[in-house]
Interface confidence: low
């Protein structure tokens, strides 16, 4: 049940041994009583005990004091338990008879004569207080207290609610007075089954089985799961969200592996020559005069550099050169010419004006040609006019930039990006190429928009050769070998001259 | 005293709507999640709605959920149910209660309770 109504009989007297008919009992009246608990009636009325009833063993004869007794026959205080919500009113029948018959029993022995009744109706709050009252009528009188109170596990102002400590699967938590739940250390909820984690752990990125723990999710990582993982292989980059690998500055491809500031990084040009950010390596050195080779470490001899103009031919000293000039020319480097507009020495369709009052002439050279007798054609590359890496070539009378991946435009100073329209699945990384967006897969997907779910690890037969580093999660076939200098192909098996600007996706 | 004082109930054609008050007295409000329960004729008690103490978390009966929106203002110790889309089977008088114990749909027993308003949909 949900409460017990408990009736402590205290003392009975009936001085005269009288019974409520005016008779008297023969020797004494043998006392027992029957108690009836029903709701709350304004007039009480004959009809079944609602609330519960309960009759006690012969108690004394006549006066009497009854003693507390917690068990067996006789029990004192009596209990009347109920289970429904107490609803705070009641009415209470205490009736005292005379019985000739068993002491034990003697609500079924006949002739059972009433000796009084009291009747008390009001209301009565759960709690652990006894109410204590004393009622006469002109023969008798009785002291008695009565109180309700809740049974284990039920809790309030009415008994109403159910309440069980627990400290498993389904909840941790003790009971409050009010029967509401307090939760254990370390649990939250409604029902205390959702443990507190870690202080401080994230709540997307983490998640706790058990109080004081913080688990990270796939792509997380630290004390608090506040620190994205970047993608397998990223060498120069960082992430805001898993798997990303945003490049550091001075740092690009695909892995943040490519030195974009080869030049400050390395100094790699020697002899005073000048180093650009370009070129299949990543950087390019123009030699000064004299000087030669990748790194312009290599000394030419002095005549290398052709200082003689105008068809002069060089000869080699110890620490110089001497030019030999050709007819009409004259000066050190051959610079000077006696010649004029009347000899023809304009090259390739130049115009000749004469200078000097006809002493000498200038030539003005069609496009495409240069020098002082237009006999040079342009190199149109060697104002570097490609950007962002883009690879000079000489195309007839023009010049076209070829540019590096994710670059267009005619000087390659456009950049394009396919990655706008979130073309990757699964939290795959986006990268701009020539012929379109690649993307770099997390852990466990591959396919070229990370669409194909793997559960093997495609790199681990060793499929590259040549040193080439392998990656998986890029393409259908799960790997991507991106390969050394000097090799290409799927698999880096080819040696080439010249390594491609991308490294082949298998 | 405790007091629980329900308002704002009437005769509804099917389709209108109405709006319940419940003013509280003589205990701290704010302290208590609060509820609604009705009861039809010749029917027990129906939980219709709760809310929590702070007014962020709210919960409905599967027959009222997206129909009636319950609210409660601290500062003004009431608590209010918006009713829409009214049909006859709301008819029923309406309590405010406070929730003591909870099922796994809502709340099941009640600590204090209104006297309650009659809201009677019919054309």
């Known amino acids: 049940g949900s409460g017990i109504f408990q009736l402590r009989l205290q003392e009975f007297v009936n001085q005269r041994g009288m019974l409520a008919n005016g008779q008297s009992c023969e020797p004494g009246c043998r006392t027992f009583f029957r108690i009836c608990l029903k709701h709350f009636q304004a007039t009480f009325s004959e009809g079944p005990c609602t609330f519960g009833n309960v009759s006690t063993p012969v108690l004394g004869t006549n006066s009497f004091v009854v003693r507390d007794k917690n068990s067996g026959s006789g029990r004192n205080p009596l209990q009347l338990p109920f289970n429904f919500t107490w609803p705070g009113t009641f009415s209470l029948n205490i009736q005292a008879w005379h019985t000739p018959g068993d002491d034990l029993r003697p609500e079924t022995s006949p002739g059972n004569s009433l000796i009084s009744q009291i009747i008390i109706q009001g209301s009565l709050a759960v709690g652990k207080i006894w109410r204590t009252d004393e009622q006469n009528d002109t023969l008798t009188r009785l002291s008695y207290s009565y109180r309700v109170i809740c049974s284990d596990n039920y809790y309030g102002e009415s008994c109403s609610r159910l309440c069980k400590k627990r400290d498993d699967h389904f909840g941790h938590y003790e009971c409050q007075p009010d029967g509401s739940l307090s939760c254990l250390p370390g649990w939250t909820g409604k029902y205390c089954d959702q443990p507190i984690c870690l202080s401080g752990c994230h709540e997307q990125n983490g998640y706790c089985s058990k109080p004081d723990e913080c688990i990270c999710r796939p792509g997380w990582q630290g004390r608090l799961c506040n620190e994205c993982i970047p993608h397998n292989g990223c060498r120069h980059g960082t992430c805001s969200i898993p798997w990303q690998c945003a490049c550091d500055e001075g740092w690009g491809g695909l892995f943040c592996d490519q030195d974009l500031n080869y030049c400050t990084h390395h100094s790699p040009c020697k002899n005073g020559s000048t180093c650009s950010n370009s070129g299949p390596k990543g950087y390019t050195c123009t030699c000064l005069p004299g000087y030669t080779g990748e790194h312009c470490e290599l000394g030419l001899s002095k005549c290398a550099s052709n200082p003689c103009r105008n068809g002069g031919s060089c000869k080699d000293q110890e620490n110089s050169y001497h030019c030999l000039c050709p007819p009409g020319y004259y000066g050190q480097h051959c610079e000077h010419s006696t010649l004029t507009c009347a000899d023809s020495p304009c090259f390739n369709g130049g115009s000749c004006r004469e200078r000097n009052q006809g002493s000498s002439y200038a030539c003005e050279c069609p496009p495409n040609f240069t020098g002082s007798n237009c006999e040079k054609k342009v190199d149109r590359c060697t104002s570097n006019p490609c950007a962002n890496g883009g690879q000079c070539q000489n195309r007839g009378p023009s010049r076209t930039c070829r540019c590096r991946p994710g670059f267009t435009g005619t000087h390659c100073e456009l950049h394009i990006s396919d990655c706008a329209r979130s073309p990757c699945a699964h939290g795959g990384t986006c990268h701009d190429l020539e012929n379109g967006p690649v993307c770099t897969c997390p852990a466990g997907f591959s396919g070229r928009r990370c669409e194909v779910r793997i559960t093997h690890d495609a790199c681990a037969s060793g499929p590259c050769f040549n040193g080439a580093t392998c990656y998986t999660g890029l393409s259908p076939n799960n790997f991507v070998c991106n390969c050394p200098y000097g090799f290409v192909g799927s698999r880096c098996e080819f040696p080439v001259g010249l390594p491609p600007s991308f490294p082949w996706v298998a | 005293e405790v007091q629980l004082v329900e308002s704002g109930g009437g005769l509804v054609q099917p389709g209108g709507s109405l709006r319940l008050s419940c003013a509280a007295s003589?205990?701290?409000?704010?302290?208590?999640?609060m509820s609604w329960v009705r009861q039809a004729p010749g029917k027990g008690p129906e939980w219709v709605s709760a809310i929590n103490s702070g007014g962020g978390d709210t919960y409905y009966a599967d027959s009222v959920k997206g129909r009636f929106t319950i609210s409660r203002d601290n500062a003004k110790n009431t608590l209010y149910l918006q009713m829409n889309s009214l049909k006859p089977e709301d008819t029923a008088v309406y309590y405010c209660a406070t929730p003591r114990g909870w099922g796994p749909t809502g709340p099941h027993e009640y600590g204090y309770w209104g006297q309650g308003t009659q809201v009677t949909v019919s054309s």
């Open positions: 003589g205990f701290t409000f704010g302290n208590y999640d």
